[in-house]
Interface confidence: medium
């Protein structure tokens, strides 16, 4: 591992569409990829009238947008579906929404999904 970088070897896995996609609904996913590539975790979710509905969580391939992010934070302002990625084992276990354009308090607290 490179000093100062969290290497991702596994991520929390969740798939709301598990029956159609023929996967487990939830679990831990080992992350694979070429040795010269970085690996990340991701989470996607919806906020329906203040209720958090997780869509997917799992491993994410080498993506510059995820580099050196130890926390999974969506910064896009009011997306239809929220997405965040991060580096470090199981770093997608918790995810948050902190819109970049706002300097007020976050609109939602960090979320810890229930299995």
């Amino acid at each position: 591992a490179i000093l100062g970088r969290s290497e991702t070897q596994e991520c929390l896995f969740f798939n709301a569409n598990w029956e159609r996609d023929r996967t487990n609904q939830t679990g831990v996913e080992p992350c694979y990829g070429d040795k010269d590539k970085r690996r990340h975790c991701f989470a996607t979710w919806k906020n329906i009238s203040g209720s958090i509905e997780i869509v997917k969580q799992g491993c994410w391939l080498d993506d510059i947008n995820c580099y050196d992010r130890t926390d999974c934070i969506e910064k896009k302002d009011s997306p239809e579906v929220y997405f965040c990625c991060c580096e470090g084992n199981m770093c997608n276990e918790k995810f948050s929404y902190f819109p970049e354009m706002e300097v007020t308090q976050p609109t939602s607290n960090p979320v810890t999904p229930k299995p």
């Epitope: 996609d21 694979y32 996607t44 994410w60 391939l61 997405f83």
Partner: antibody, heavy 120, light 107 residues
Framework: EVQLLESGGGLVQPGGSLRLSCAAS????????MNWVRQAPGKGLEWVAG????????SYADSVKGRFTISRDNSKNTLYLQMNSLRAEDTAVYYC?????????????WGQGTLVTVSS | DIQMTQSPSSLSASVGDRVTITCRAS??????VNWYQQKPGKAPKLVIY???SRASGVPSRFSGSGSGTDFTLTISSLQPEDFATYYC?????????FGGGTKVEIK
Amino acid sequence: EVQLLESGGGLVQPGGSLRLSCAASGFTFSSYSMNWVRQAPGKGLEWVAGINYNGGYTSYADSVKGRFTISRDNSKNTLYLQMNSLRAEDTAVYYCARSANWHDTALDYWGQGTLVTVSS
Amino acid sequence: DIQMTQSPSSLSASVGDRVTITCRASQSILSFVNWYQQKPGKAPKLVIYAATSRASGVPSRFSGSGSGTDFTLTISSLQPEDFATYYCQQSYNLPLTFGGGTKVEIK
């Protein structure tokens, strides 16, 4: 170097069977999900089937469900596609392709393909 | 199933031109889109994954953008070796689905 080599294609009559193989090398085969994608002559790409790293999960396109079976032998670094009840519309070049995870990732390496022709 | 609609189906361009290909998904697929290049008689080759990330060995003139339902592949300065057919593909849900392809031809 990652290499995927398909074999087993050929001419078969409608209703017949064929088994395609894809020999993998240059990577840890047992860590990757694998897929079959086909391309009819002069047409676009169509995903056919996928299998996760240990064979525990498989999924199929509606067009081949119940007729095709994807499987793998990690001890031989080989992916298979058993094709039964073949139809003229199954005529295509069949490619095997690797993906890092069961779904939600790209097909990052492809074989050169093997041609399946279904005709009487 | 998620439909991927690609446009245009073909285009003619000259070396040095900036080329843009678009792909629209029938529902939001976040950043779960990939782009492939295919030359006649050859296997497809991954160019862009996760909407914006360039695959290994792909020149910097190739870039991807978009999220949700609308995606773009851009070649900033077309080179002779770039004349090929390009496909978008969604990996948000199974079954994996591809766009119909865009053939980039020499003007």
